[in-house]
């Protein structure tokens, strides 16, 4: 597992970016666990960073990802409606210059280095559930979230509302 | 332009049941979780619950769990609550009220209907 | 559940004067904190969203400000339209609760 201190060094930092002329309302360090409370971890394989999905071992620290909260006006869907509505989205960075991506033609969560403005694909609508676990819906892809599919992240396409509250798609931010 | 518009007054019985009605209209019914709190006379705000329009996933104050029924009906956007075994103390303007962000709770409630008074007396 | 408590329960104030509301979460809420106005008869209106952001249409007079748990409504410069009664919500978890309510009145 990486960047637990890397991401609470450049966190100060982050406060004065912009992404696309806008500011994040807040940010909050966070670790991530699944509703069955497995916990997303990170690591480094083969100069690359791979993403895990893992019953951690008692005394482990969990990996610590940094969430930036950003307004975004809410398209409406039907039209003549009025398009008061406004939507949270999320950008998800466990290290410095590197956020999850949601890699649609490949059904992924990866991670990037990449620098500002970010791509469409690292951000994510966020839902909160009455359970007060959350979810992440794809800016680029709606109707498809992050979930966990073989203890490992991926994309997954919603096919009903009925669905919206299936427990794969469900997360857990905790600030311990 | 977005609105929410309540049912009328009611007046009931002890023991009894009420339905107030909740008609949405000028957004996307579906988008946006529907809340219901009450204000007893000259009493604060109370939050009674809130319902998904998607799924009709529920979330009821423990206060409220066992007499509090939220619905909704997705054909004409309206959402209702129930509240059965109507004491006196359940006298009181009853509000809906939607969220600000779509999908999350987290922005509070930027439209509320007008208010329905439920008066319990014998 | 998350506790919220404000204070003052009431307060008296002058037109001109710069009244400030705190309120106070049990637990951490980030920034996810709504202040809303209600005169008597009338619903709620939303007046601050996540802690700090003027809704629309809403005065510059008022501000938010605040994270975490401690929280604060400003109004910098009192309007005879601006008493009434003032509460705040926390949107961060289930149950949402609201605070006990501040009423502003004349002096």
């Known amino acids: 597992a990486f960047g637990i201190s890397g991401v609470q060094k450049y966190t100060r930092a982050l406060h004065d970016s912009s992404i696309t002329g806008i500011s994040p309302i807040t940010e909050y360090l966070a670790s991530l666990s699944t509703y069955n409370d497995q916990s997303i971890t990170f690591a480094l394989e083969d100069e690359s960073y791979e993403i895990y999905v893992e019953d951690l071992k008692k005394d482990e620290k969990k990996d610590k990802v940094l969430l930036s909260y950003y307004e975004s006006q809410h398209p409406s869907n039907e039209s003549g409606d009025g398009v008061d509505g406004k939507m949270l989205m999320v950008t998800l960075s466990p290290t410095k210059d590197f956020w999850l991506h949601a890699n649609n033609k490949e059904h992924s969560v990866e991670l990037h280095k990449c620098e500002k403005p970010l791509p469409d694909q690292a951000f994510f609508v966020l839902h909160n559930m009455h359970s007060n676990c959350v979810s992440f819906e794809c800016k680029t892809d709606p109707g498809v979230f992050i979930g966990v599919k073989d203890n490992h992240l991926a994309l997954i396409k919603v096919d009903s509302s009925e669905n919206l509250c299936t427990e794969n798609i469900l997360f857990k931010l905790s600030e311990t | 332009e977005v609105q929410l518009v309540q049912s009328g007054a009611e007046v009931k019985k002890p023991g009894a049941s009420v339905k107030v009605s909740c008609k949405a209209s000028?957004?996307?019914?579906?988008?946006?979780?529907m809340n219901w709190v009450r204000q007893a006379p000259g009493q604060g705000l109370e939050s009674i619950g809130d319902?998904?329009?998607?799924?009709?996933?529920?979330f009821y104050n423990q206060n409220f769990k066992d007499r509090a029924t939220l619905t909704i009906d997705k054909s004409t956007s309206t959402a209702y609550l129930e509240l059965s075994s109507l004491r006196s103390e359940d006298t009181a303007v009853y509000y809906c009220?939607?969220?600000?962000?779509?999908?999350?709770?987290?922005?509070?409630?930027?439209?509320w209907g007008q208010g329905t008074l439920v008066t319990v007396s014998s | 559940d998350i506790q919220m408590t404000q204070s003052p329960s009431s307060l008296s104030a002058s037109v001109g004067d710069r009244v400030t509301i705190t309120c106070h979460a049990s637990?951490?809420?980030?920034?996810?904190l709504s202040w809303y106005q209600q005169k008597p008869g009338k619903n709620p209106k939303l007046l601050i969203y996540?802690?700090?952001k003027l809704h629309t249409g809403v005065p510059s007079r008022f501000s938010g400000s605040g994270s975490g748990t401690d929280f604060t409504l400003t109004i910098s410069s009192l309007q005879p339209e601006d008493f009434a009664t003032y509460y705040c919500?926390?949107?961060?978890?289930?149950?949402?609760?609201f605070g006990q309510g501040t009423k502003v009145e004349i002096k």
């Open positions: 009220a939607r969220h600000y962000y779509y999908g999350s709770s987290y922005g509070g409630f930027v439209y």
């Open positions: 000028g957004y996307t019914f579906s988008d946006y979780n």
């Open positions: 319902i998904n329009p998607k799924n009709a996933d529920t």
């Open positions: 637990q951490n809420i980030n920034v996810w």
């Open positions: 996540a802690a700090s």
């Open positions: 919500q926390q949107g961060q978890s289930y149950p949402l609760t």
